[in-house]
């Protein structure tokens, strides 16, 4: 029977993801009972992605490794709407690594997922990025400008934001 085979497929997919995430929160997409989209519990979801705020303080490299262990990457922010969603879950007195770095110190910024960096769609604080030796990007709160990005030294431990595609089962 169709529903039975669909359930069996779902269960095998869920087993696949259990190595990363013991628990998933799933919602039915639209009216079709066949399509469920899931995020690991307790990640948050926005559009087609899941987000996790990591409160452990680590360097940029270790933060990216921490995300990848969970099947994710440091966050790539593509739109103002996405940033507006993310900041709802951040603390104003903390800074969080983004998946954005300038490894050569040439101001050729790179996103971890190879999305081409487009300065027209960036949210740097005014006057940033301002130091060739500061090669990793964070998002933080400044009272004058609200939330924005800043370049910092990559080895300085920060909190971080992980992002992964929603799991469809």
């Amino acid at each position: 029977n169709f529903m039975y085979s669909k359930t069996v497929k779902r269960l095998s997919k869920l087993r696949e993801y259990q190595q990363y995430h013991p628990s998933l929160t799933c919602v039915m997409e639209g009216k079709d009972i066949e399509d469920w989209s899931c995020c690991p519990t307790p990640w948050t979801s926005f559009q087609s992605s899941c987000y996790f705020i990591s409160t452990g303080m680590q360097s940029w490299t270790k933060s990216q490794k921490n995300c990848s262990v969970m099947g994710a990457d440091l966050v790539v922010i593509n739109t103002r709407e996405e940033q507006d969603f993310i900041i709802q879950n951040l603390k104003r007195n903390s800074s969080y690594f983004l998946g954005l770095s300038d490894p050569g110190g040439r101001r050729h910024w790179q996103w971890v997922d190879q999305t081409p960096y487009n300065e027209n769609v960036t949210f740097w604080h005014s006057g940033e990025p301002n130091n060739l030796d500061e090669r990793c990007a964070i998002i933080n709160f400044r009272s004058s400008e609200e939330w924005g990005w800043n370049d910092i030294h990559c080895h300085v431990p920060q909190k971080s934001i992980c992002k992964m595609k929603k799991i469809y089962i």
């Epitope: 040439r106 101001r107 050729h108 910024w109 999305t115 081409p116 960096y117 487009n118 300065e119 027209n120 740097w124 006057g127 940033e128 990025p129 301002n130």
Partner: nanobody, 120 residues
Framework: QVQLQESGGGLVQPGGSLRLSCAAS????????MGWYRQAPGKQRELVAV???????NYVDSVKGRFTISRDNAKNTVYLQMNSLNPEDTADYYC??????????????WGQGTQVTVSS
């Protein structure tokens, strides 16, 4: 294919000034950072100054206070005003641009270089 054309190099006496220009042409969607690099004989190419699309500039320590980078986004052009030149500034100066050819295709473009000689 994007072309970068430098101009403004030449021979100048110590303490003198030069203004380099670099214009980008070709199929360009947008340009992120634009910068100037230099390579002295027998040395590696090094970054001199770089400027973001929004006008944030960064300089290497050896030129701070003497060189000024600027750009005209409408003309896809970057400039380098060089004051108080000294013989150590003698080098071939290369323009570089981080170009978006389309919203999802990126190219690291270089000019052919312009020679700057500081000598009395």
């Amino acid at each position: 294919q994007v072309q970068l054309q430098e101009s403004g190099g030449g021979l100048v006496q110590p303490g003198g000034s030069l203004r380099l220009s670099c214009a980008a042409s070709g199929r360009i969607f947008s340009i992120n950072a634009m910068g100037w690099y230099r390579q002295a004989p027998g040395k590696q190419r090094e970054l001199v100054a770089v400027i973001s699309r929004s006008g944030i500039s960064n300089y290497v320590d050896s030129v701070k206070g003497r060189f000024t980078i600027s750009r005209d986004n409408a003309k896809n052009t970057v400039y380098l005003q060089m004051n108080s030149l000294n013989p150590e500034d003698t080098a071939d100066y290369y323009c570089n641009a981080d170009v978006l050819l389309t919203f999802n295709k990126r190219e690291d473009s270089w000019g052919q270089g312009t020679q700057v000689t500081v000598s009395s």
